[in-house]
Interface confidence: low
């Protein structure tokens, strides 16, 4: 089966837009829009810090850490109100991702 131009293969994702807001000193806010072509029961998410199709139930329940969003060796924790997650590196550096 051939794909039309711009059509994603099932189970794959692409980042549609990327931007960084460096207006706040010492803090970088990165924004992204990800487009995925997922199988039934899946939805766009993040696995091992890369865009991926994940089980839709994870998104519905906001159990973000269940999609394994952090890199291997990092610890995942839910933010208050399940608004996102943090990835804590072994050295203690914390990377925060919020879902909007």
């Amino acid at each position: 089966q051939f794909l039309k131009e711009g059509q994603l293969a099932a189970g794959t994702c692409e980042i549609v837009t990327l931007d960084r807001d460096s207006s706040q000193p010492r803090r970088t806010i990165a924004r992204q829009t990800v487009k995925c072509s997922c199988f039934p029961g899946q939805i766009a998410g993040t696995t091992r810090a890369r865009p991926a199709c994940v089980d839709a139930r994870i998104i519905k329940t906001k159990q973000w850490c269940d999609m394994l969003p952090c890199l291997e060796g990092e610890g995942c924790d839910l933010l208050i109100n399940r608004s996102g997650w943090t990835c804590t590196q072994p050295g203690g550096r914390i990377k925060t991702t919020t879902v909007s």
């Epitope: 711009g6 072509s37 810090a49 890369r50």
Partner: antibody, heavy 121, light 112 residues
């Protein structure tokens, strides 16, 4: 196993357009960002450009107008529009990866073995 | 235009020594750097991405560090098989101007 293979490299005369192709095995090219990189004999690596799954492209400033990256459902192609002797190099295609969620670092996780292009009179 | 200044151009080390290669970006690249090893006649292979993340299958003697515009690849306890040329790749993708990637000039590592 995920692999890339380039083809189309050969001896051409200056000014003769040449198109190189990159094919994948073990994964579906259509869903990935792909890049082309070249290396002149005895020299370092030079990034040429990138093509997105949507088909849009970005190029290094020096490569704009000199190269065109395009794709089909099974290949990613690089056209050297008007080759000069300075374009003699090994050309690599590479799969682009990048981790997201807290940054947009871009890197190449799979490379092809390269294909040699020689531009000579 | 992003410029990646890689130093030193070449170095010689004995087995077991620690080797450090530095790349200085012309602007803050937000950890958008990766490191590659290339041996003669072969394509490069990924060692480190996102400044400090070790690619799967790469020996742990390789490590990356740095932030902002200053980054370092360290080979702790260099081995004979580490003789190669090493390259950094810097870049950041913005929605406004697209992707801009630049390689450093390379560092040739010789093992005595």
């Amino acid at each position: 196993q995920e692999q890339l293979v380039e083809s189309g490299g050969r001896l051409v005369t200056p000014g003769t357009p040449l198109t190189l192709s990159c094919t994948a095995s073990g994964f579906f090219l259509s869903g990935y960002y792909m890049s082309w990189v070249r290396q002149a004999p005895g020299k370092g690596l030079e990034w040429i450009g990138i093509i997105y799954p949507s088909g849009s492209t970005d190029y290094a400033s020096w490569a704009k107008g000199r190269f065109t990256i395009s794709k089909t459902s099974t290949t990613v192609d690089l056209k050297i529009t008007t080759p000069t002797t300075e374009d003699t190099a090994t050309y690599f295609c590479a799969r682009v990866a990048g981790y997201v969620g807290y940054g947009y670092e871009t890197f190449f996780d799979i490379w092809g073995p390269g294909t040699l292009v020689t531009v000579s009179l | 235009e992003l410029v990646m200044t890689q130093t030193p151009p070449s170095l010689s080390a004995s087995v077991g020594e620690t080797v450090r290669i530095r790349c200085l970006a012309s602007e803050d690249i937000y950890s958008g750097i990766s490191w590659y090893q290339q041996k003669p006649g072969k394509p490069p292979t990924l060692l480190i991405y996102g400044a400090s993340n070790l690619e799967s299958g790469v020996p742990p003697r390789f490590s990356g560090s740095g932030s902002g515009s200053d980054y370092t690849l360290t080979i702790g306890g260099v081995q004979a098989e580490d003789a190669a040329t090493y390259y950094c790749l810097g870049g950041v993708t913005y929605s406004s101007t697209g992707t801009h990637l630049t390689f450093g000039a390379g560092t040739n590592v010789e093992i005595k």
